[in-house]
């Protein structure tokens, strides 16, 4: 199980002194700087128990493996569910603490209930402040059951849950119907995935027999030991005031673990520290009791005395949980409670024993989980002990589990179980990811998902040109860093593979799948320059450029023109996909805009140096169209046009332009300027008789505006052929602008 403890300080006289601390004993826990070590998270979980919003809680990190939550301002801030998450990958674990208000109407007799699959769980809510109304039980925030207030038994409301299954796990609450939810009794029910004493898929494996109140984990068969105990079977007591899987942590403050609730990974739940009991963990154990919540009884024999933290303290000549074993009986010494090896390795395991008579090589044996017995290949005999060495055959996954070292002499026998974890070297499930590429280097992210077991100690990146038979180049990198492959050939495909390793002999995994990464083209080096440009309309610009002459083929696929509109903060990019092109027409520009213009050569995805920029001002767009244009024939050669000025003018009109065209004619139209912008009529002269004409107009301010509607009119008959139309405005002759 993950070495993760959530501590709640229950000295509740002042909520501002209340704190929660999450402590991880995992290697590298809480670093959070890379994908291999996510941070410890400690938070209030408001999904089930919602409390009124208050000021945000303060989270303080103390080193890499501890995080503390403070800033509780009122007692209601404390009520509810808190969780700490730690461990990496598949070992990521959530530890949960449920806090009850000491002033609630209903109080739990016991907050955490850990039961086996198929058991009957009984949750008991003690009446603290009576109300004569229904009691509603909820499970994970949803309605579960109702009890009449008359149904209390000895001042307690009981919820019986027969034949519980793992989905029944969760937060239960008992609340008087018309009371505040904060006055509820909150419980945590943990249902192991197996029946008593069993673990594993199908619950076929036997638990190691956890001591001192340890709980067998239904997934891995490990004992989750109560705070203050350690060892594969929780057989060893820590020194007073210490906790953690290796007793490595110390309770804060001068009164040791008094007033602290300890929450551990499921299926353990929460309890007081060793030697303490009571709803606030402030009461010392009664004589003859010891351990977490004082749940254990000493029953010491042969003159042993009961210590409330560790149990029986035996006089010399005796050992065992109850001082029931004589020291003449052989004893396994200093056996590690857990060993880790990599798959398919052939490790050596040592087992030391002492006793009277003295154990010899043949009296010590090693038993594997499948019952196979290994005999030692050699033994080292010292004055105080014999150490037997066992050569283990090539390990397979089925060797994971509890091994046993057993010593037998005429004085008796002793055995010690220890956990062997056979770890699978990591194998990448995916190819490495290309982050960026240049012509001579590739930047690669080697962090990929993997099968097998972590932690990852090293990452090797193997690479060589595609279709090459040359040796692979290898680079060893830190797991958390991106890798730059240097000195590569441009425009070349490289096959790249990742190999991961975990600690220990034989920890190198197989190579991951290959991926093809291609270096970029050579960068284009030529810098174009802008030859010129001219405006072809209020929104059109023709640009031309040149390139320096250099020997050899041109390295480039085309040109990129960039127009920067500084006023609006917008960039327009125009791709010219021929490297031979030296001119381009840019359309759809914004009239009246000041643009900065440059051009650069591109090759593949790489851009060459930009030309020196040019600054171009497009003329503004013209005014709206004149309104209500009307044509009226005056004679066989004259037509009068009348109109109304455009609306919403952006400035004074400088002139009008009339377009004249013979209806159905194929020739170009004629443009005639009306240079008196105040006028609203004009006469077009010199037209042909009996001819149908089309007219339209537009105004000009700084640029020409929109055309008006087109009107048709025919000249009167019997006239002579005219030289061409001219215009008169209020009897003033004007020139022709074609």
């Amino acid at each position: 199980a993950v070495d993760l403890t959530l501590l709640a300080n229950l000295r509740l006289t002042d909520p501002q002194r209340f704190f929660l601390t999450c402590v991880s004993g995992e290697a590298g826990a809480g670093r959070g700087s890379d994908a291999w070590g996510p941070p410890l998270l400690l938070e209030k979980d408001d999904r089930i128990v919602r409390t009124p919003p208050g000021p945000p809680l303060r989270l303080a990190r103390n080193g890499s493996h501890q995080v503390t939550l403070r800033g509780f301002s009122k007692p209601s801030d404390l009520v509810g569910v808190f969780s700490c998450v730690g461990g990496a990958g598949a070992r990521r674990t959530r530890v949960i603490y449920v806090h009850n208000s000491p002033g609630a109407h209903l109080l739990p007799d016991k907050v955490t209930h850990t039961v086996n699959k198929g058991d009957t769980a009984v949750l008991s809510a003690r009446v603290h402040k009576e109300k004569q109304t229904d009691v509603i039980w909820k499970s994970n925030g949803s309605y579960f059951y109702t009890l009449d207030w008359h149904e209390a038994q000895d001042g307690r409301f009981l919820l019986q849950l027969p034949n519980v299954q793992p989905p029944s796990s969760g937060i239960y609450s008992a609340t008087y119907l018309e009371a505040s939810p904060l006055g509820s009794a909150f419980f945590r029910l943990i249902v192991r995935g197996c029946g008593a004493g069993r673990w594993g898929p199908g619950c076929t494996k036997e638990c190691p027999g956890c001591l001192h109140g340890g709980v067998c984990h239904d997934h891995d068969g490990e004992c989750v030991c109560p705070p203050g105990f350690t060892g594969t079977r929780c057989e060893q007591a820590c020194r007073e005031g210490r906790f953690g899987q290796s007793c490595q942590e110390q309770c804060p403050g001068i009164s040791g673990c008094r007033g602290l609730t300890f929450c551990l990974p499921d299926p353990y739940g929460c309890s007081c520290g060793s030697g303490w009991r009571g709803s606030q963990c402030q009461e010392a154990c009664a004589p003859g009791h010891f351990g977490a919540d004082c749940r254990l009884q000493c029953q010491c024999q042969n003159g042993g005395t009961c210590d409330r933290f560790s149990g029986c303290v035996c006089p010399s000549g005796w050992h065992g949980v109850h001082c029931e074993k004589s020291d003449r009986i052989p004893q396994i010494l200093n056996m590690a409670s857990e060993l880790e090896f990599n798959l398919e390795t052939m490790p050596r395991i040592n087992c030391a024993a002492a006793g009277n008579p003295f154990p010899v090589r043949g009296s010590i044996e090693l038993r594997k989980p499948d019952g196979t017995v290994l005999l030692s290949t050699k033994a080292i005999v010292e004055p105080e002990k014999t150490t037997a060495e066992f050569e283990v055959p090539r390990l397979v996954l089925a060797d994971s589990g509890f091994w046993e070292c057993r010593v037998s002499t005429s004085g008796g026998q002793d055995s010690r179980r220890f956990k062997v974890n056979v770890k699978v070297p990591p194998v990448p499930l995916a190819a490495p990811r290309l982050l960026t590429k240049q012509s001579r280097q590739l930047v690669v992210s080697p962090l990929v998902s993997f099968s097998g077991d972590g932690p990852i100690s090293t990452v090797r990146l193997h690479y060589r040109p595609q279709d090459s038979t040359m040796d692979w180049s290898t680079i060893v990198v830190d797991p958390s860093e991106n890798v730059t492959l240097m000195n590569l050939r441009p425009k070349t495909g490289y096959s790249v593979r990742v190999q991961l390793s975990r600690p220990g002999e034989g920890g190198e995994g197989a190579w991951g799948p290959p991926t093809l990464m291609t270096t970029d083209c050579p960068e284009p080096l030529l810098q174009p320059w802008l030859e010129g440009w001219h405006v072809e309309g209020t929104d059109r610009l023709r640009v031309s450029w040149s390139l320096p002459l250099v020997p050899g083929p041109l390295v480039g696929d085309g040109f990129l023109l960039r127009l920067w509109d500084g006023t609006r903060g917008q960039e327009r990019r125009e791709n010219v996909s021929s490297p031979q092109a030296r001119t381009a027409l840019l359309t759809g520009l914004t009239p009246g805009t000041h643009y900065q213009l440059d051009v650069q050569l591109y090759h593949c995805t790489l851009l060459g140096p930009a030309s020196p920029p040019a600054h171009v001002l497009l003329p503004p767009s013209g005014p709206p169209a004149p309104r209500h244009l009307h044509a009226q024939a005056l004679s066989d050669s004259e037509i009068q046009l009348t109109w109304k000025h455009p609306e919403a003018l952006p400035g004074p009109i400088s002139k009008y332009v009339v377009e004249v065209q013979v209806a159905g004619g194929a020739g170009d139209p004629l443009w005639i300027d009306v240079d008196r912008p105040e006028e609203t009529s004009t006469i077009i002269r010199g037209l042909n008789a009996s001819t149908r004409y089309l007219f339209r107009m537009r105004a000009s301010i700084q640029g020409l505006g929109d055309w008006s509607n087109t009107v048709e009119e025919s000249t009167l008959g019997n006239g002579l052929q005219a030289e061409g139309p001219v215009q008169e405005s209020r009897a003033a002759e004007e020139g022709l602008d074609q």
Partner: antibody, heavy 117, light 105 residues
Amino acid sequence: EVQLLESGGGLVQPGGSLRLSCAASGFTFSRYPMNWVRQAPGKGLEWVSRIWPSGGSTVYADSVKGRFTISRDNSKNTLYLQMNSLRAEDTAVYYCARDSSRYFDVWGRGTLVTVSS
Amino acid sequence: DIQMTQSPATLSLSPGDRAILSCRASHNIDNFLAWYQQKPGQAPRLLIYDASHRATGIPPRFSGSGSGTDFTLTISSLEPEDFAVYFCQQRTNWLFGGGTKVEIK
């Protein structure tokens, strides 16, 4: 689908008896309090009786106290109302209703009881 | 006993109108009040509980407010299917109000 289905209604003479049943499905019947609510023709709703999930506690409206008995069989997911000494004013559609916090969140379609000579 | 009084007895409105229904308790009932809708020939349906919480599946045009003795059910914009009888109920002794009929004008 959560469902309640009443049965057992009919025509009965004053002073007679009738037993209504309500079959529950689609939820864990044994965990919920159950109620009978009635509605006289063209009138409003009147709560009649409630039974707690265990069956150990019951409560009645004053108008039916001593004449009606509510019961349940959790193994059969069924609620009952035994009605004795029936009166003309007991004529109504009788609904069975589930409650979780003394509000009726699931109702049956009702069964008509007519008390007439 | 706490008595529940609903007003008006009948409310004549058109689709799209806003409907405001009132329920008064004879004593303080905090927010322990529910509203139900009943259409002809059908069982009642829970709309609002604890004075202001919409029951599952109830559209947002239905809203409840009030606390103590005065409570209101508001239908923001009447749909054709909303024309029905509405009852309030206090949960202490399961007493219902006399009902308000919302009919088409």
